[in-house]
Interface confidence: medium
């Protein structure tokens, strides 16, 4: 099945084309007007990127966040924007690229040892970690080093990939996010901001692992645009 192929990174239902059937089989999904939802089991990954409407960060790729495209713009019109690199200004963690977090309005590296102690409060009780800092205004509550081992295992609740253990990323699964395995070579991956395909990925995949990039599978080059399959491939 798709699940086993994707090693727990299933996207069973990718968003339909604009105007296509919406709704997850056996469920009712609703949201802000104008946003369509996952329908059939079709891969709809296209290289021709277009702005991707969104209502919250989880709809966007791991290297994107959801915001108004213009400063002080209409809050009702939001799209997925490229994440902000190190030392760029930010307002919340999701704005910063993977491996970084928002500290004092600037994206800084989360590789430093003190990161987890700085932004976590009392964390070890449920699933994995429970943050108080999603709004990007972290409380400086330094914890002892014994807290650093609390990174979430596969299936743990998470808010950011830095919450998860090595080899895992934080990806959307229905209405929450959990730690899932980073994709390996040959596994199906997702290109975000599909042209004419606006919707929430309720099963979000992780990104490709180190040394890999998400590219069209070679034998799929001749396929029609709507069925091009992307896989994690060596650079």
């Amino acid at each position: 099945t798709l699940n086993s192929v994707l090693n727990s990174n299933a996207i069973k239902n990718l968003p339909p084309p604009l105007g296509g059937a919406a709704g997850h089989p056996g469920s009712a999904v609703s949201a802000a007007p104008g946003i369509l939802y996952p329908g059939g089991n079709k891969y709809q990954t296209i290289d021709n990127y277009q702005p991707y409407p969104c209502a919250e960060d989880e709809e966007c790729g791991t290297d994107e966040y959801c915001a108004s495209p213009t400063r002080g713009g209409d809050a009702g019109v939001q799209i997925c924007l490229a994440c902000r690199k190190r030392r760029k200004r930010c307002m919340r963690h999701a704005m910063c690229c993977p491996g970084n977090y928002c500290k004092n309005g600037i994206c800084v590296s989360s590789d430093q040892n003190h990161f987890r102690g700085e932004i976590e409060e009392t964390i070890t009780e449920s699933f994995g970690n429970d943050h108080s800092t999603l709004d990007g205004y972290s409380r400086r509550t330094t914890l002892s080093s014994k807290m650093y081992h609390t990174k979430g295992q596969e299936g743990s609740v998470c808010l950011r990939s830095s919450d998860c253990a090595s080899g895992l990323c934080c990806a959307r699964h229905f209405w929450s996010k959990i730690c899932k395995p980073v994709l390996k070579e040959g596994q199906v991956c997702t290109k975000h901001r599909r042209k004419g395909s606006h919707g929430l990925e309720i099963f979000q995949r992780c990104y490709c692992g180190e040394g890999l990039s998400c590219r069209i599978q070679k034998d799929h080059h001749q396929a029609s645009n709507s069925s091009r399959l992307h896989t994690c491939q060596r650079h």
């Epitope: 949201a31 609740v157 209405w175 929450s176």
Partner: antibody, heavy 114, light 107 residues
Framework: QVQLVESGGGLVQPGGSLRLSCAAS????????MSWVRQAPGKGLEWVSG????????YYADSVKGRFTISRDNSKNTLYLQMNSLRAEDTAVYYC???????WGQGTLVTVSS | DIQMTQSPSSLSASVGDRVTITCRAS??????LHWYQQKPGKAPKLLIY???NLQSGVPSRFSGSGSGTDFTLTISSLQPEDFAVYYC?????????FGQGTKVEIK
Amino acid sequence: QVQLVESGGGLVQPGGSLRLSCAASGFTFSSYGMSWVRQAPGKGLEWVSGISGSGSYTYYADSVKGRFTISRDNSKNTLYLQMNSLRAEDTAVYYCARHYMDHWGQGTLVTVSS
Amino acid sequence: DIQMTQSPSSLSASVGDRVTITCRASQDISNYLHWYQQKPGKAPKLLIYGASNLQSGVPSRFSGSGSGTDFTLTISSLQPEDFAVYYCQQYDSIPMTFGQGTKVEIK
């Protein structure tokens, strides 16, 4: 610690309405998806509905679709379940739960009977 | 909908016994499976998440295994407080579904 407290249950006639509330504390409420799960007397567990952290996305079981509405007020750390057109088969203890049911409330009993 | 079938429906065991409960999904659910314990008049309590991860605060005598369609909850040495009903639940797809429950009674 994480705490979820349901309220609003009671006796209601078939066709009637009821609104359940779930007050959350001990965690950053807006960061977590939430669920409602019910358990009919002497029976097993049934997932009813789920909602994303921002409240933008809602999900329902077929048995309640079109009759129940899940919502949340993050400023009040409160989850809601508006239940309309109630039927006898909706009689159950209703639990609110965090995320994929890692923490549960104590439940509130809803009885639909004439 | 994905059907979750637990077996046995009930079992009688003694303190110190090793107890195994199985749960079968009607289709592949990867490792998106929880195990719960429920005592009379109480809310369910999460024991195992992601098929095999022990929830914080849960005694190590509880363990979970399996992936795909077949899963197992094992209690290595049954304690008096373990007599309860146990449920499996899949969160691979909506609607999320539970097994019918396994009642563990005192022999």
